[in-house]
Interface confidence: low
Amino acid sequence: QPPPPPPDATCHQVRSFFQRLQPGLKWVPETPVPGSDLQVCLPKGPTCCSRKMEEKYQLTARLNMEQLLQSASMELKFLIIQNAAVFQEAFEIVVRHAKNYTNAMFKNNYPSLTPQAFEFVGEFFTDVSLYILGSDINVDDMVNELFDSLFPVIYTQLMNPGLPDSALDINECLRGARRDLKVFGNFPKLIMTQVSKSLQVTRIFLQALNLGIEVINTTDHLKFSKDCGRMLTRMWYCSYCQGLMMVKPCGGYCNVVMQGCMAGVVEIDKYWREYILSLEELVNGMYRIYDMENVLLGLFSTIHDSIQYVQKNAGKLTTTIGKLCAHSQQRQYRSAYYPEDLFIDKKVLKVAHVEHEETLSSRRRELIQKLKSFISFYSALPGYICSHSPVAENDTLCWNGQELVERYSQKAARNGMKNQFNLHELKMKGPEPVVSQIIDKLKHINQLLRTMSMPKGRVLDKNLDEEGFESGDCGDDEDECIGGSGDGMIKVKNQLRFLAELAYDLDVDDAPGNSQQATPKDNEISTFHNLGNVHSPLK
């Protein structure tokens, strides 16, 4: 049956609508024309569209689609961006507090070791920050560097304070002796294990969040193909060519078109689901030695224990080192070793983790719950976009891409569309290169997240701790590994409440080596940002 003639025989309505899209009327016919040059809105009779109008409609349709996609992902994007920033800042704060606790421990118990200890501690925690933010620093090297630096100071200031300045070139010998004689016992190894595990997990957690942002940004800024542009034009604008200004596309037809346009994007769905579930598994395992908050805030206590260990063995060590480093010392100096009680301040600060409403772990769990509500985000996108654009309810009296129909039939619509475009062909093209790239990145992060899955996952241990624990080390499930207990324990107000004062600092924050310049806006940190002296502008 022939289509109904345009209600407006002068194309007046079409002209006034089109003028809103494109000022000037030179492209709009004054009266209906045959439209034999049209390629998208193929006419079954006279039409109020020209080829130029069709091109403009296609451009507008693709822009509309991009805006719809961006508004669809806005909430999810904000959720991940906000949390990535919050966690990055929170991790920086944990590191800063851990550094301050450690400096306070030195200040309270070993004042003679400062300011050198502040410098070494500052450098260690700067490296911790950089590692979390993705730099390839070896955690074992960081810990070794800390203890290598500390031991000569402990030896010359605490164990053998009688050494004259002329004998202080024994530092290199002392650094070597530190490892050879295991002067700190198994404490360095213990710290390596704890710090490695907790930081690796923290780093992958941040990496995963940043990749989440990248995924959304990629799909957010997709440029839709010309084929898709034609389908969208047919759905949203071709009815205007017939003067049907108020007619809405059929809902079922919209779904078919959207599935065609978004076939590539929807391929992300499988990997996106896996990403959220893997992230959940990672978060569930982030406790005890896999929780950087727990590990780092208890480090000062372990370092204190390690110094006590040295002091317990000071007599024996001083004799051995005296012989070992004699060539450096020229002659043997009197050991000024005193009973350990002299050095141990019973007021040593120990952290008792207080239960509080909003810890990092509760914040992580909250994020996962919110992310899980977006687990079907990609598979639901076509439906979401149709429900947020004008479509006819119940598929009655609606536009099917060619004509106004009483009821939408997918089969009829497809048959009618065969000569215009091949929906199947559009789907078979496969995802855009950028989508393929992001799928590859998701696969990679999912693999990393799976290998990181804690307590079950011993893969982590294999990577980090190839020698296994030595006697005296703590196993994964020994709570007493971290922090401490006993007479010296005092309660420390939790600093990590997100709604509370984020910038709380202990009084040693301006100690040498304590300046930490981080760039929370980047998911990386640049060497030169950290190298540049505060006085030299970088740009």
Epitope: P115, F118, E119, G122, E123, T126, D127, L130, G134, S135, D136, I137, N138, D141, M142, E172, P512, G513, S515, D522, N523, E524, I525, S526, T527, F528, H529, N530, L531, G532, N533, V534, H535, S536, L538
Partner: antibody, heavy 120, light 112 residues
Framework: EVQLVESGGDLVKPGGSLKLSCAAS????????MSWVRQTPEKRLEWVAY????????YYPQTVKGRFTISRDNAKNTLYLQMSSLKSEDTAMYYC?????????????WGQGASVTVSS | DVVLTQSPLSQPVSLGDQASISCTSS???????????LHWYLQKPGQSPKLLIY???NRFSGVPDRFSGSGSGTDFTLKISRVEAEDLGVYFC?????????FGGGTKLEIK
């Protein structure tokens, strides 16, 4: 084993352009900051460009700013140096180098170099 | 930019002897965080530079213990306790305390 292999060096006329590549292997390329350093015919070393691990923070000295562009493709483990408006004083051996951040900017591994000659 | 001046330009030495190379900076290389980012590289004939010492005195992995670095502020020294044939080449000092990083002019270690 850490390996950095530069390519793309050539003889080019003043005002011309050239793109150097550096293929990295044997380490996690995407987690290291990288630099290009050149060595003049007089054997002086000069740092010419730096890029952070994710590629978001390039830096250049004034001598090449606006003419040279450093970039990286972490998926391909490759570092690039796009050089344009070349001058005779850009003639040098160009090395790509890995910045080990734990070494605070010390360049712990260097490639074998790519020779660039700018001459009419 | 920070200027690093190396001396001597050439250092003739007999195998087994000690060699000493000096590097002087136009401004202090002590960073505000308390560290000094002064590094030493060796470039053997026909090869690219190799890292020897980082942060004044830390030997890079695989570097023999006959190499040692010292100094502070603006004056630094690289010592080779017993020169071996494989040590011959050009030694460069470099700083990364200030941006941009800069290199010394080089000191050629050669057989007497």
């Amino acid at each position: 084993e850490v390996q950095l292999v530069e390519s793309g060096g050539d003889l080019v006329k003043p005002g011309g352009s050239l793109k150097l590549s550096c293929a990295a292997s044997g380490f996690a390329f995407g987690t290291y900051d990288m630099s290009w350093v050149r060595q003049t015919p007089e054997k002086r070393l000069e740092w010419v460009a730096y890029i952070s691990s994710g590629g978001n923070s390039p830096y250049y000295p004034q001598t090449v700013k606006g003419r040279f562009t450093i970039s990286r493709d972490n998926a391909k483990n490759t570092l690039y140096l796009q050089m344009s408006s070349l001058k005779s004083e850009d003639t040098a051996m160009y090395y790509c180098a890995r910045q080990n951040i734990a070494r605070r900017g010390a360049m712990d591994f260097w490639g074998q170099g790519a020779s660039v000659t700018v001459s009419s | 930019d920070v200027v690093l001046t190396q001396s001597p330009l050439s250092q003739p030495v007999s195998l087994g002897d000690q060699a000493s190379i000096s590097c002087t900076s136009s401004q202090s290389l002590l960073h505000s965080n308390g560290n000094t980012y002064l590094h030493w590289y060796l470039q053997k004939p026909g090869q690219s530079p190799k890292l020897l010492i980082y942060k004044v005195s830390n030997r890079f992995s695989g570097v023999p213990d006959r190499f040692s670095g010292s100094g502070s502020g603006t004056d630094f020294t690289l010592k080779i306790s017993r020169v071996e044939a494989e040590d011959l080449g050009v030694y460069f000092c470099s700083q990364s305390t200030h941006v941009p990083p800069t290199f010394g002019g080089g000191t050629k270690l050669e057989i007497k």
